[in-house]
Amino acid sequence: AWELTILHTNDVHSRLEQTSEDSSKCVNASRCMGGVARLFTKVQQIRRAEPNVLLLDAGDQYQGTIWFTVYKGAEVAHFMNALRYDAMALGNHEFDNGVEGLIEPLLKEAKFPILSANIKAKGPLASQISGLYLPYKVLPVGDEVVGIVGYTSKETPFLSNPGTNLVFEDEITALQPEVDKLKTLNVNKIIALGHSGFEMDKLIAQKVRGVDVVVGGHSNTFLYTGNPPSKEVPAGKYPFIVTSDDGRKVPVVQAYAFGKYLGYLKIEFDERGNVISSHGNPILLNSSIPEDPSIKADINKWRIKLDNYSTQELGKTIVYLDGSSQSCRFRECNMGNLICDAMINNNLRHTDEMFWNHVSMCILNGGGIRSPIDERNNGTITWENLAAVLPFGGTFDLVQLKGSTLKKAFEHSVHRYGQSTGEFLQVGGIHVVYDLSRKPGDRVVKLDVLCTKCRVPSYDPLKMDEVYKVILPNFLANGGDGFQMIKDELLRHDSGDQDINVVSTYISKMKVIYPAVEGRIKFSTGSH
């Protein structure tokens, strides 16, 4: 028998520095977790203790903190090289700055193979990107070889900016011939490493003949066997065992997100490359694991540029940006409008001639807007200003909801109106009218939404049975502020870009902003 240790991360999302337990900014260092310096300590410890070790990343290193905003992926290549990653699969967020923003900082600088079997380049890009990412790689490990085959969510064109010269194929259809190719090369130990979410990971384990292990990402899935060590609730045991169509037991793993855990999976293969056993658990990277001093010193060196960036002007406002709780938790506020407009702008993807865009709607809990910005400071808006407005380090995500769920959400928005509670929704691409004289749960008297399948966008009444795409904070997607109906009834959820980054990009693009209160949210009494 031959034993392999797979160490894996996914959805690190720019958390190069240690973070608090909820993966936001580290405040009390003695209670902080993750970060590349701590990760390196643990990885090195395992490499020294065990013979056949692979360190793999299942995508979405890009996007999530000011590190990515400033360094645009160069930080990913630098620190992943420093940690000696063995391979990485492309995630959807790796395309956030377009193909060029992937090629130059990451693909050309990475000293490890970057993989995806279901992304096919065409046109002039094909030669430009040739060899910079691969469908699979045969990695020598000890005196054996292991085949790693990559995959990426086929939804990427809707979630990011891969452009028109990359085709995202069905994962299973694309993976099978590559695995077959590995088999003809007598590679009998094959890992599928990719970024399509836990459901697809399980399908790959079930359907792709020859795949021995699946290491996934995208859905931030936490798996654990035994008592979990932190706040995350396991979605299943680690590894999650799938019985393939040809009768094999295939371990599937994922390691939550944000570099909080290091996935640790030990696999035993027989001489024919069959998995005999698999066991392990994610390792919580808490403060009991010291940060490696040389990596930490490097982090501090790179940090300097971030501190300078946060005080630079992004753009100007010529109006007061009202982000006060007195406004945003009671009525339409122009800061809410600004943020929602930025959220929609960030999701402009012309992927279909029938649609002017794939999504037109935004909702945003007023309680998530934490500060106004005064225009009387020469109109200057900095990252620092925006960090005061959006201090929680969240993301603006894409969900699919039925109209009936949206209606429930808007009822929840005003079910206890007047108490300055955070659930009052700010909106974009939506016109809502409330009648507060009616009983809670029946206060939405008009709800019109901006069409997407139209050449001239206009507002139409919400249809209860129709499925709509909506951009919202991850906080709401996860049922925060009492929006349990969103969490329970959402049909799809894809995590998006860092909230501050979305707004800062929009302000930089617009240069001068002047958001108004324009009647998106209205109150009425009486009949309609």
């Epitope: 000696r84 490890f112 193979p113 469908p135 190719k181």
Partner: antibody
Framework: QLQLVESGGGLVQPGRSLRLSCAAS????????MHWVRQAPGKGLEWVSG????????GYADSVKGRFTISRDNAKNSLYLQMNSLRAEDTALYYC???????????????WGQGTMVTVSS | QSVLTQPPSASGTPGQRVTIPCSGS????????VYWYQQFPGTAPKLLIY???QRPSGVPDRFSGSKSGTSASLAIAGLRSEDEADYYC???????????FGTGTKLTVL
């Protein structure tokens, strides 16, 4: 400056052993995979063996498998090639080369030594 | 014997553009990167192109690499007398599980 210096070559009888060394300087040695490449007189280049940054992955050309052993000592910035059961066809100039990657030695060789000559003859 | 095939010789006059082909298979060029080396008599090889088309710093942009399917080629534009050398393509081969060099091409500048 970046430098690789090979040593240990010489004339040896068939069936005997030889150990080649390569001393590295001017770069962080344990950041990179390292290789041995040989060139028989008047012939082309042939990859002999490679070793990853932490010795976690090791590979050999079929022609030397079971006879040659590659190793490295990162503390000493040194690469080694232990050559046993030498044959006449192992006669060549042996180069030490640095990879541009650290991993499973499938990168490019961007720094080469000047080589050490191994002659296997009775 | 080498699994990457190159013509034994190529030639051109100063200023001309010459192309040196390298033919492989799906287990090497087909799925892995191609590298090119230049070697002058009596000296160690020098890396010219890595990852199919990238040039290390210091290599003139007269040298360019390309890859299509299981074949690759090195193009030298504006040929100069100092380009006279041996040129080798190379890359990892998943089948033999090793690094393979091409047979080498001797370039003569007429």
């Amino acid at each position: 400056q970046l430098q690789l210096v090979e040593s240990g070559g010489g004339l040896v009888q068939p069936g005997r052993s030889l150990r080649l060394s390569c001393a590295a300087s001017g770069f962080t040695f344990d950041d990179y995979a390292m290789h041995w490449v040989r060139q028989a007189p008047g012939k082309g280049l042939e990859w002999v063996s490679g070793i990853s940054w932490n010795s976690g992955s090791i590979g050999y050309a079929d022609s030397v498998k079971g006879r040659f052993t590659i190793s490295r000592d990162n503390a000493k910035n040194s690469l080694y090639l232990q050559m046993n059961s030498l044959r006449a066809e192992d006669t060549a100039l042996y180069y030490c080369a640095k990879d541009i990657w650290y991993g499973g030695f499938f990168g490019a060789f961007d720094i080469w030594g000047q080589g050490t000559m191994v002659t296997v003859s009775s | 014997q080498s699994v990457l095939t190159q013509p034994p010789s190529a030639s051109g006059t100063p200023g001309q553009r010459v192309t040196i082909p390298c033919s492989g298979s799906s287990s090497n060029i087909g799925t892995n990167s191609v590298y090119w080396y230049q070697q002058f008599p009596g000296t160690a090889p020098k890396l010219l192109i890595y990852r199919n088309f990238q040039r290390p710093s210091g290599v003139p942009d007269r040298f360019s690499g390309s890859k299509s399917g299981t074949s690759a080629s090195l193009a030298i534009a504006g040929l100069r007398s100092e380009d006279e050398a041996d040129y080798y393509c190379a890359g990892w081969d998943d089948s033999v599980r090793g690094y393979v060099f091409g047979t080498g091409t001797k370039l003569t500048v007429l």
